[in-house]
Interface confidence: low
């Protein structure tokens, strides 16, 4: 089809080299198309997102992306070439940096419902670069966490190091959506609930003397508890002594809860004490299996082919540790009687 | 059929408690609606009291002079939201709808039929 | 608190008329505001959101303009059935709540 009659977007990704991160196209199509196609995705502050019903039977995947070559040859199916990058209903999600995202992206309707459809698309120009500027040390993470029950804030990286003051007027959305309230380089949350965890995007618009261009990032937002205060707890096994019969095998379970902590770094591990002697003993992983926000339960098993005189002697010991602490658990094996 | 039943309306002194539910069916609290309530005194406009995010967590909002007197809550087992409402004035005198917020916009656009309740000595 | 004015407070049309209602924002709210229908003993009525979005099953004689502060709800060719109050509520979203802001709501009555 022919791009020339699209409405044209310059965007421009400055990420950081040390820091993983996302970006994201939205399709912007001109009105009135964009309420058939993106209606609950990415809106303009014309229009206001709703989760009301009757919209429920818009299909939100009736965009098509391509990326256009520089070399002029035909528009390629983003789909098909570009594994890094995902559609989700009428967004572009880039999953990894690198100057090779450079380029044109053009969105339209997958449907041609009317003539005036045909011209409906959006040609984005994306320019990718490497963050240069090392005057900003402290430039806002991609990633952001807010503290649950508390006040907190969430900045837009590539305008960090600027004073509020200074700030250009910036956009932003979360989820896709317009936050039409928010204006400044860094959103100050009242108080932070579960519903502000998403995916934040902000924008402003750059000028020089030849063009502008909208600078965008995205940021991660993860709402979290206070770090916990209290080592882990063993919730199994509960019982000191476990029946066993000798010669079959056996599988003693540790589950043990584990508190939040921003930097987390679980163990969970069995060892034997055999009289004098005590060692680790090589079992399969731990896994996880239940997280919340609070905490998370992790499980490592110690698995035994058959179970001998010798391990009736000897203590199993489950040890588990975070950095306020540790607590043990051991198991002494006794023979099922009759 | 979805839709919102309030009941609990009553006649109150000055001064006195009184709590509101509304029942709701053909939808489920577990998704991730504002329910909110909102007053109509008699004769006058539409007026916003107080909402709560029925999604994972029980996030409470209320109009500035309803903070302090009045509290939501709900009750997703039962599917219900409720309004405790404490230290009765006669200008509370006025008919209390439930409705449903879609998503995180807060357009109702679902209503209950209301209840009325009456402050009076 | 946006404070939302109405105007005017209550207006007098026959069937057939064009009726304009006004709506004013204490501030800039862009086009997050929402226009509702109410009969006497009934829930109000969603009619429009997003100061010009139809809401499903809404009549298409009803329509919305309007951003930033002020905002007008129209009702091309007034119908027995359109006699009623309207309101129009401030929905601003951000990521703090932000009330809903109901204005003093206009009367229509039969001239």
């Known amino acids: 089809f022919n791009i020339s009659g699209c409405s044209t977007k310059k965007l421009l990704w400055t990420y950081s080299t040390r820091s993983e991160e996302e970006f994201v196209l939205f399709c912007d199509l001109p009105e009135p198309q964009k309420s058939h196609f993106c209606h609950r995705n990415r809106l303009s502050p014309k229009q206001v997102p709703e989760h009301l019903p009757f919209m429920g039977s818009n299909d939100l995947s009736d965009v098509q992306w391509y990326q256009q070559p520089s070399n002029g040859d035909p528009l390629e199916d983003i789909r098909k070439s570009y594994p890094h990058i995902i559609q989700d209903k009428c967004t572009l999600h880039f999953l990894t940096p690198g100057v090779n995202n450079s380029g044109s992206y053009i969105c339209r309707p997958k449907m041609i419902k009317s003539p005036y459809d045909v011209a409906c698309c959006v040609k984005m120009i994306l320019e990718v670069k490497p963050q240069t500027n090392a005057s900003c040390e402290y430039s806002a993470s991609h990633k952001q966490d807010l503290l649950l029950g508390s006040t907190g804030s969430i900045s837009c990286p590539s305008l960090s190091c600027q004073s509020d003051a200074q700030s250009p007027a910036v956009t932003w959305y979360k989820n896709g959506k317009l936050l039409s309230v928010e204006r400044s380089n860094r959103i100050v949350v009242d108080e932070v609930y579960d519903y502000h965890q998403g995916t934040y995007v902000c924008d402003y618009t750059q000028s020089d003397t030849v063009s502008s261009w909208t600078v965008r990032a995205v940021v991660q937002v993860r709402t979290i508890v206070g770090d916990t205060k209290l080592k882990p707890d063993i919730l199994d096994p509960v019982e000191d002594t476990l029946e066993v019969e000798l010669g079959k095998p056996l599988t003693i379970s540790c589950k043990a809860r584990f508190g939040f902590e921003r930097v987390f770094n679980p163990v969970i591990k069995w060892y034997i004490k055999d009289s004098d002697l005590e060692w680790e003993v090589s079992v399969p992983e731990a896994k996880s299996i239940k997280s919340t926000l609070k905490d998370e339960i992790i499980e490592r098993n110690i698995i035994l082919e058959k179970v001998t005189q010798r391990d009736l002697r000897r203590k199993f010991v489950c040890f588990v540790q975070n950095s306020i602490g540790n607590t043990t658990q051991s198991v002494q094996l006794k023979e099922k009687r009759g | 059929e979805v839709q919102l039943e309030e009941s609990g309306g009553d006649l109150v002194q000055p001064g006195g408690s009184l709590r509101l539910s509304c029942a709701a069916s053909?939808?489920?609290?577990?998704?991730?609606?504002?329910m909110c309530w909102v007053r109509q005194a008699p004769g006058k406009g539409l007026e916003w009291v107080a909402c709560?995010?029925?999604?994972?967590?029980?996030?409470?909002y209320y109009a500035s002079w309803a903070k302090g007197r009045f509290t939501i809550s709900r009750d997703t087992s039962k599917n219900t939201l409720y309004l405790q409402m404490n230290s009765l004035r006669a200008e509370d005198t006025a008919v209390y709808f439930c409705?449903?917020?879609?998503?995180?916009?807060?357009?109702?656009?679902?209503w209950g039929q209301g209840t009325l309740v009456t402050v009076s000595s | 608190d946006i404070q939302m004015t109405q105007s005017p407070s209550s207006l007098s049309a026959s069937v057939g008329d064009r009726v304009t209602i006004t709506c004013q924002a204490s501030?800039?709210?862009?086009?997050?505001l929402a226009w509702y229908q109410q009969k006497p003993g009934q829930a109000p009525k969603l009619l429009i959101y997003?100061?010009?979005t139809l809401a499903s099953g809404v009549p298409s004689r009803f329509s919305g303009s309007g951003s930033g502060t002020d905002f007008t709800l129209t009702i091309s060719s007034l119908q027995p059935e359109d006699f009623a109050t309207y309101y129009c509520?401030?929905?601003?979203?951000?990521?703090?709540?932000?009330?809903?802001?109901f204005g003093g709501g206009t009367k229509v009555v039969i001239k």
């Open positions: 409705a449903r917020g879609g998503g995180i916009i807060y357009t109702q656009n679902l």
């Open positions: 053909g939808f489920s609290f577990s998704r991730s609606y504002y």
């Open positions: 709560i995010y029925a999604g994972s967590s029980d996030s409470t």
């Open positions: 501030e800039d709210i862009e086009s997050y």
């Open positions: 997003s100061a010009s």
């Open positions: 509520q401030c929905i601003l979203y951000g990521v703090n709540f932000v009330p809903n802001t």
